[in-house]
């Protein structure tokens, strides 16, 4: 299976708001996505969130600071393809984020 | 088009401090991470470390293996970045280049770490011998 | 930390296809590039992101990445493509820069 193709849509100080798609042939086999997340350079903790929809914002970041998100569908028979890990950045107070 | 022109001492010494420097010509300098890689004769390339600048402050990443020996600056200035690797052996013996990344850093919130290395430097042969 | 996994070396003859592989530890969910290095020369970037193409490059060299495994695909070899390819990727775990030992591509 295809893994997901994941898109960063929109960002703030403390937020990212994150899209993805895989081939419509494969979505009905997918229970739910799950979305593991952590702030770069933080090897040791990590977070998850799971929807059955095509995105997610996460919350309560922290600002001017880089995150790397992947997707990997769940299927009823377990884990399916995972997406790649990207890298998304939060803006920066100033709002002067590059 | 970017061009990279490096130079810097091609004969050392051992225990002496190996000193290059990169000046970056034709394109923008702020955004990227610039980094050196070295390559000992006949063998294979190896990442040493890289700089941003970013803002006032410089961001940099060096390879585990050579930390405590490297240290990579910058002349924003000038458009250069240098590298000074400290005591060296004849295991740093090798041609050392630049190089300059195939995108900025981040675009728009979305990051490239280790990106591709579109631009190299020509390269400059160091050899360390007593 | 890390490692890139290529063959030493890969011999085809002219015409014919030559394949080089990058191995490495869930490989697939990392961007791969790949470089051609010819001697006494810097390396040229011919892939990047698995399976992109820098402006003139030939169409005659692709890529994919999938699993454990990363392919340079060369179709239709000439004289001129032997050289040394390297891969690379970035270790997310340690933030560093990671290259396979590298690949010598001879010609027959």
């Known amino acids: 299976t295809e893994p997901p193709k994941v898109r960063l849509e929109g960002r703030s100080t403390t937020s990212l708001s994150v899209s993805w798609s895989i081939p419509p042939p494969q979505q009905s086999r997918v229970w739910k996505y799950e979305v593991t997340y952590r702030k770069k350079g933080d090897s040791n903790s990590y977070n998850v969130r799971r929807t059955e929809g095509f995105s997610v914002t996460l919350d309560d970041l922290a600002p001017d600071t880089t995150y790397l998100v992947q997707v990997q569908a769940l299927t009823q028979e377990g884990q399916g393809a995972g997406s790649k890990v990207h890298e998304f950045q939060t803006l920066s107070p100033e709002g002067s984020g590059n | 088009q970017v061009q990279l022109q490096q130079w810097g001492a091609g004969l050392l010494k051992p225990s002496e401090t190996l000193s290059l420097t990169c000046a970056v010509y034709g394109g923008s300098f702020s955004g990227y991470y610039w980094s050196w890689i070295r390559q000992p004769p006949g063998k294979g390339l190896e990442w040493i470390g890289e700089?941003?600048?970013?803002?006032?402050?410089?961001?940099?990443n060096y390879n585990p293996s050579l930390k405590s020996r490297v240290t990579i600056s910058v002349d924003t200035s000038k458009n250069q970045f240098s590298l000074k690797l400290s005591s060296v052996t004849a295991a740093d013996t090798a041609v050392y280049y630049c190089?300059?990344?195939?995108?900025?850093?981040?675009?728009?919130?979305?990051?490239?770490?280790?990106?591709?290395?579109?631009?190299w430097g020509q390269g400059t042969m160091v050899t360390v011998a007593s | 930390s890390y490692v890139l996994t290529q063959p030493p070396s890969v011999s085809v003859a002219p015409g014919q296809t030559a394949r080089i592989t990058c191995g490495g530890n869930?490989?697939?969910?990392?961007?791969v590039h790949w470089y051609q290095q010819k001697p006494g020369q810097a390396p040229v970037l011919v892939v990047y992101?698995?399976?992109d193409r820098p402006s003139g490059i030939p169409e005659r060299f692709s890529g994919s990445n999938s699993g454990n495994t990363a392919t340079l695909t060369i179709s239709r070899v000439e004289a001129g493509d032997e050289a040394d390819y390297y891969c690379?990727?970035?270790?997310?775990?340690?933030?560093?820069?990671?290259f396979g030992g590298g690949t010598k591509l001879t010609v027959l």
């Open positions: 690379q990727v970035w270790d997310h775990s340690s933030d560093h820069v990671v």
């Open positions: 700089i941003n600048h970013r803002g006032s402050i410089n961001y940099n």
């Open positions: 992101d698995d399976s």
């Open positions: 190089a300059k990344p195939l995108r900025p850093h981040c675009i728009n919130g979305v990051c490239y770490s280790g990106d591709a290395f579109d631009i």
């Open positions: 869930n490989i697939g969910y990392k961007n």
